[in-house]
């Protein structure tokens, strides 16, 4: 029985050109996990895997680093940037774990970053 | 509980147009995340296009952008899906779903808390 919780930061707001943070906590399970992607709507952006390491997709190196932890930061943001980010946690014995973020890369100076919020 | 009909499909010759409609009977619809998903006999559902709230930003899948338009009115709980230069390919039946005080579009079906009956889309050859 899955009994976990993602917990994310939510709905973000970024400044086009800045760089954000984008993070996933897993919690109320002591299921292990096993490896984290982060996904862009269908692309994969990178995976943190328990026992490798991280492995940032190729066509986003220039714009990914991984961390803090098991987040993932994203830089030289643009526009196109603009859409739903996903972290899926594999773990043993539970199964998968899904977390959504909603990133709006604003042109202007008035991002600001959304509330945290329990996933359901 | 919301309830989500839509309206608009039928058969079609392809190169041709159809518009589908969602009528949500929620009067809190304005905060609802929209989608429409298709799915084919023997395929898995997928998501077509997504609509935010706001009607701001819009999810298009690859292979129908520039053909297909999603559009909202909140003045009448109803989100569109205007289709244009259809193909044989984008035969299914099309469904429209609905999520509760969504932030943003959503482009996984898991997120969605209410489903229309689905109407089917034909487009022959």
């Known amino acids: 029985m899955m009994t976990g919780t993602i917990e994310t930061t939510g709905n973000i707001s970024a400044e086009k050109g800045g760089s954000i943070i984008l993070q996933c906590h897993l919690s109320s399970t002591t299921a292990q996990v096993t490896q984290v992607n982060w996904e862009q709507q269908d692309q994969l952006l990178a995976i943190c895997n328990a026992d490798l390491g991280w492995h940032i997709s190729p066509s986003f190196k220039d714009r990914v680093a991984p961390g803090p932890g098991l987040g993932l930061t994203l830089q030289s943001l643009t526009v196109n940037d603009t859409g739903e980010y996903f972290c899926i946690y594999h773990t043993y014995p539970d199964g998968t774990y899904t977390g959504r973020i909603f990133l709006e890369v604003l042109e202007s100076s008035v991002a600001e970053h959304g509330a945290r919020f329990q996933i359901p | 509980q919301v309830q989500l009909v839509e309206s608009g499909g039928g058969l079609v010759q392809a190169g041709g147009s159809l518009r589908l409609s969602c009528a949500a009977s929620e009067r809190t619809f304005s905060s609802f995340a929209m989608g429409w998903f298709r799915q084919a006999p023997g395929k898995e559902r997928e998501v077509v296009a997504a609509?935010?709230?706001?009607?701001?930003?819009?999810y298009y899948k690859d292979s129908v952008k520039g053909r297909f338009t999603m559009s909202r009115d909140n003045a009448k709980s109803t989100v569109y899906l205007q289709m244009n230069s259809l193909k044989p390919d984008d035969t299914a039946r099309y469904y429209c779903?609905?999520?509760?005080?969504?932030?943003?579009?959503?482009?996984?079906?898991?997120?969605?808390?209410?489903w229309g009956q689905g109407t089917q889309v034909t487009v022959s050859s």
């Open positions: 609509i935010d709230p706001s009607g701001r930003y819009i």
């Open positions: 779903a609905a999520r509760i005080r969504g932030e943003g579009y959503y482009t996984r079906s898991s997120f969605y808390h209410y």
